[in-house]
Interface confidence: medium
Amino acid sequence: PHLRTFTDRFQTCKVQGAWPLIDNNYLNVQVTNTPVLPGSAATATSKLTIIFKNFQECVDQKVYQAEMDELPAAFVDGSKNGGDKHGANSLKITEKVSGQHVEIRAKYIGTTIVVRQVGRYLTFAVRVPEEVVNAVEDWDSQGLYLCLRGCPLNQQIDFQAFHTNTEGTGARRLAAASPAPTAPETFPYETAVAKCKEKLPVEDLYYQACVFDLLTTGDVNFTLAAYYALEDVKMLHSNKDKLHLYERTRDLPGR
Amino acid sequence: SPCKILKCNSEFWSATSGSHAPASDDTPEFCAALRSYALCTRRTARTCRGDLAYHSAVHGIEDLMSQHNCSKDGPTSQPRLHTLPPAGDSQERSDSPEICHCEKSFHKHSATPNYTHCGLFGD
């Protein structure tokens, strides 16, 4: 999936399986990514687990879990708030669009999370105070915590290089783990550009991600995924000057 | 990544020592600390296979759970945190002590916090 980190780095990660997105004293978020097509290096998020840890007199520990075709509007125990404590309503789940869009607000830690199902896959966005991000007992052990550290260099796909290649087949071939084609050949580059331009008129990294995803998969739903990801940034990012990211902010290989 | 069992141990030691000691008449607190500990060991299980300290912790938890009649399910305890205010700071004076001002607990401590964003989407 495409990752925008807490430090506004933008990466395309091929990480497969379960990976921690966030891990601190209050909140633990883990994603499971699966290949979008057989033989493809590109992966998308198929499962998301969010643990709100027990917090003082406010909330009991609550676990939220979403999977492909299952975006519940409740925690795994069936509740929609923080439990039986007096401050339970400082943690709330709201269903915005049934089966497609959920918002979780954890007021006690000033945090808002948006989870969506777009097509078959999930998207995740969070707004969280730096103070909460930094609330960790063991900095040395934070390891591969994607929102903070980004994904390891050997797990990154340099998708911006694909964008400079105007031939769709070139992009598809680069995205594949083997030479086998990974997406229908019927999706030319020009069509991908047109589809993405429709929803994302600014040629930023969200637009480029959209083009990459269409060329890689042929699945038009990824256009919406990029569009909603940018909409969520508009709602959640505190710096309105940083809504759009452009090529110069990307991680260079070896950095 | 390394086995994180010591993190679990030290969190448990911190939660159950000194002024945080589980009083014998306050078994729910102790059980909550044990459940947190058990959860911590489960999270690090994958990286701790074959680690004697890990297996010792798991057996120790089982012993203590049965000794103190703790149920496997129930509330967990909050590890002592250093960054946000302690529980006392998140309560404002009120005529109704039942009302918890958890909505204010964060903002009260840091009037205008610096927010940060992370997002994951697409492939």
Epitope: E137, D138, W139, D140, S141 | P2, C3, K4, I5, L6, K7, N9, S10, F12, W13, S14, T16, S17, G18, S19, H20, A21, P22, A23, S24, L34, Y37, C48, D51, L52, A53, Y54, S56, A57, H59, G60, I61, L64
Partner: antibody, heavy 120, light 109 residues
Framework: EVQLVQSGAEVKKPGASVKVSCKAS????????ISWVRQAPGQGLDWMGW????????NYAQKLQGRVTMTTDTSTSTAYMELSSLRSEDTAVYYC?????????????WGQGTLVTVSS | QSALTQPRSVSGSPGQSVTISCTGT?????????VSWYQQHPGKAPKLMLY???KRPSGVPDRFSGSKSGNTASLTISGLQAEDEADYYC?????????FGGGTKVTVL
């Protein structure tokens, strides 16, 4: 075999600092805490504090707060205890000990001890 | 700092039983799962004999046993042997109020 091997004896002047090392072997260093305990000549044992090699978290005895610093180097599986502003009553044998595994806090393996003499 | 009080010395003949007490407060002993006992021979490092009040590490003979009643923990050596002559210390982990008892000299007559 699980072992803790400590550095050699030290003689220091009052006001100086001393740093004692404790090299661990035979087990996963980051899976156990390290405690430091001292024993003045003819006296009992005195707990100084502990450190988590895994995280660097420490817990010091109240009376030593501000004077003691415990650190670890996981690359060499070595723990260090530094005591500053030494006074004559700090003359003691200093032991490092591994904190036992599992939920119970106890010290199951001990170093051989390092004699620190503070004398003008 | 609260203290853990031990008798200065106890003695017994070979084969006899001796008990060493360790009295503290409710937080240091009464409610603690962290009481342990250490044996120290002259000029040597301490050795763990019991932890969690009653648990014996491997290698420690079963003639060493522990118990707790109220705010007092006890170490009992049954069938005393010559090599048991040593100093014994109780220990309680209680955060920043962690402490050893003053020590008990066990003499085998």
């Amino acid at each position: 075999e699980v072992q803790l091997v400590q550095s050699g004896a030290e003689v220091k002047k009052p006001g100086a600092s001393v740093k004692v090392s404790c090299k661990a072997s035979g087990y996963t260093f980051t899976s156990h805490g390290i405690s430091w305990v001292r024993q003045a000549p003819g006296q009992g044992l005195d707990w100084m504090g502990w450190i988590s090699p895994y995280s660097g978290n420490t817990n010091y005895a109240q009376k030593l707060q501000g004077r003691v610093t415990m650190t670890t180097d996981t690359s060499t599986s070595t723990a260090y205890m530094e005591l500053s502003s030494l006074r004559s009553e700090d003359t003691a044998v200093y032991y490092c000990a591994r904190v036992g595994s599992g939920p119970y806090y106890y010290m199951d393996v001990w170093g051989q001890g390092t004699l620190v003499t503070v004398s003008s | 700092q609260s203290a853990l009080t031990q008798p200065r010395s106890v003695s017994g003949s070979p084969g006899q039983s001796v008990t060493i007490s360790c009295t503290g407060t409710s937080s240091s002993v009464g409610d603690s799962i962290y009481v342990s006992w250490y044996q120290q021979h002259p000029g040597k490092a301490p050795k763990l004999m019991l932890y969690d009040v009653t648990k014996r590490p491997s290698g420690v003979p079963d003639r060493f046993s522990g118990s707790k009643s109220g705010n007092t923990a006890s170490l009992t050596i049954s069938g005393l042997q010559a090599e048991d002559e040593a100093d014994y210390y109780c220990f309680s982990y209680a955060g920043t109020d962690t402490l050893f008892g003053g020590g008990t000299k066990v003499t085998v007559l």
